[in-house]
Every structure is written in C-alpha cells, then in structure tokens.
C-alpha cells in the first residue's frame, strides 16, 4: 500500500488550512480517496476528499476551522494519511507525520492597490491574508512587474527581506501600462515555500508633461 511510487506533499497556510497533493503512478482512476488528519495533541480529526487535478494526481484542502483561527502551533505534529476505498474499508496509500510550521505556504497577498503613481514611479501596497501572528515580522516578499512586450517569466524579481507591505517602483516609462504581482514567505520552516503569486494589479504611469524632458 504505502510505497515509493507515491508522492504525498502537504503545506500549512499557518492558520486553519492544510493543502495536500497526492500523486501515484498507476493509481485507480475510479477509486474514492481522502486525506485524513490526526493531530498528536488535539481532540479533533479532519478529512477531505481528494479530487483529480491531472491524470495521476489528486488534491484537497483540510479546513481545520474559521479562516483566521490558529488551529495548530509549532509543537503540533499531524499524522496525515491518504486513504482509498476498497470495498467497505479504507486502505492507507500514503502516510506522513507532518510538522505544520516546517511546511508552510501562506495564502497569496491580497488587496493590492496603487497608493500613488507618477510618470516614472508607482507606490503600491498590499496585505497578507490568514498569516499567523507567530511570525511577528519574520516574513519576506518577492515582487515582479510586467512590462509591455515581456512575459512574467522574464520579469526581474524584487526581494524585500523584511515584512514590508509596500513597494516604490522606480524608473518606469511614462504613459505605460504595467502589471504587478507579489508573493510572501515566512522565514521559518525547513520545507517552507513561497505563497502563490497575488492576483495581478494593473496600473498606468502618468504621461510626461508637455514641453518637459522625460
């Protein structure tokens, strides 16, 4: 049942959600499978139904409580199992003892807005969503700006090595349409990864004043 061809990866959003992806070569397509969570020091259990995301991978979200409730701490260990139905029983297909704060992936930043825009610069702010108070200021951000004629992959990454929920973009071209994205990562956790990118924020720089050098 539990074997090396199975990959089972989960991340904690630092508040009340554990998202899991399970992939297995040759897994049965029609079988009903779920993720079961059993914390070592709490009285609740939780399950979610695995839904297909590709030919051989499934995903689900364990909702542990209200979005901003702190359901796990740095000392918790949660036994996570992939269970697939065989007849009337559920077979263990994969298992891991999961340390939530070693496997963090926060929600994408939200509420991006243009605070101030000029011909060559733009000040943008954002907020973090459902992030634990445990982090205090121990977060970092990456941002990128999409310029005309380029792709997101070509956009240089701007790194903010502190909890700074704003940025001033410089050396922009006047009267030009841009898009901006940001993502966040806690400094804590051996297997912690970047949040998804935020929804892009579109903005346009102001045109250069007539008769003035740009």
């Amino acid at each position: 049942a539990v074997n090396g061809t199975s990959q089972f990866t989960c991340f904690y959003n630092s508040r009340a959600n554990i998202s899991c992806v399970w992939s297995q070569d040759g897994a049965l397509q029609d079988t009903s499978c779920q993720v079961h969570a059993w914390p070592d020091r709490r009285r609740w259990n939780q399950t979610c139904e695995l839904l297909p995301v590709s030919q051989a991978s499934w995903a689900c979200n364990l909702i542990l409580g209200a979005p901003d409730s702190q359901k796990l701490t740095t000392v918790d260990i949660v036994t996570l199992r992939v269970l697939c139905r065989e007849g009337v029983r559920w077979r263990v297909m994969a298992i891991q003892d999961f340390k939530p704060f070693e496997n963090l992936r926060l929600m994408a930043p939200i509420s991006l807005q243009v605070v101030h825009v000029e011909t060559h610069r733009c000040n943008i702010s954002w907020e973090i969503s459902q992030a634990s108070h445990y982090f205090e200021r121990h977060l970092e951000f990456e941002a990128r700006t999409l310029s005309p004629g380029h792709t997101w992959e070509e956009a240089p990454l701007l790194t903010l090595k502190q909890k700074q929920e704003w940025i001033c973009l410089e050396t922009l071209t006047p009267d030009t349409q841009y898009e901006f994205q940001v993502r966040v990562k806690p400094l804590q956790g051996e297997f912690t990864t970047w949040s998804p990118w935020s929804q892009p924020l579109a903005f346009r720089t102001k045109p250069a004043a007539l008769g003035k050098d740009t």
Epitope: A1, V2, N3, G4, H36, T79, R81, L83, R89, W90, R91, V92, I95, Q96, D97
Partner: nanobody
Framework: QVQLQESGGGLVQPGGSLTLSCVAS????????MAWYRQAPGKQRELVAS???????VYADSVKGRFTLSRDNTKNTIYLQMNSLKPEDTAVYRC???????????WGQGTLVTVSS
C-alpha cells in the same frame, strides 16, 4: 488482533539514558507506521518519534538530537534510545502501530519513564 508490548522504562537520573522497546505480535500483515507517544500527568499526549514503512523518521523538536528511533523488521520491534534525559521527559511512553487499513490503530499499555535525582 495485534498486540504491542513495551519495555525498558524505569527511574533514571537527569543526564542518564534508557532504551525502550516495543514488540508487535499477532496478525500483522503490514504496517504503515510505528511510533512512540508520551503523556505526562496533566499534560497532552504528544508524538515523540515515528517511522513509516518506507523508513521516514520524524522526531518531536523537544527530543531531536537526544532520542534515536530504530527498528528491527525481523523482530517486528522498534527501539527508542533516549540520551541526555531531562525531568521534563518524565511520562508514560506508549507504542502505536498504524496498519495498512484506516481502522487498524493499535496501542501498547505503556511504560513509565521517570527522570529524577
């Protein structure tokens, strides 16, 4: 039915060592994970160390570097080598086995570890 039998507990001075053993017997076809849990009086149960069928180990942060989990598949046994013991390690240590089916969860009776001078 599966039985788990722990041994090796006792009284030890701070800084001392103990090795706990857990032997699984009965109708064991396959296990997905074996683990040691502990519970001190008035405290929550906590996972101390675990090992899956593919050999992945996890240790609680409070014991990492001091405790070592090992297994002998031929004897259906896991061992917990506990070094540099502290008074806060005092607890009843219980062995747990999760089988290949979701309803296969087995516990030992537990063995008491007391760390005191």
């Amino acid at each position: 039915q599966v039985q788990l039998q722990e041994s090796g507990g006792g009284l030890v001075q701070p800084g001392g060592s103990l090795t706990l053993s857990c032997v699984a017997s009965g109708s064991i076809l396959e296990m997905s994970r074996m683990a040691w849990y502990r519970q001190a009086p008035g405290k929550q149960r906590e996972l101390v160390a675990s090992i899956t069928s593919i050999g992945s180990k996890v240790y609680a942060d409070s014991v990492k570097g001091r405790f070592t989990l090992s297994r002998d598949n031929t004897k259906n046994t896991i061992y917990l080598q506990m070094n540099s013991l502290k008074p806060e390690d005092t607890a009843v240590y219980r062995c747990n086995l999760l089988g290949t089916w979701s309803d296969e969860t087995y516990w030992g009776q537990g063995t008491l570890v007391t760390v005191s001078s």
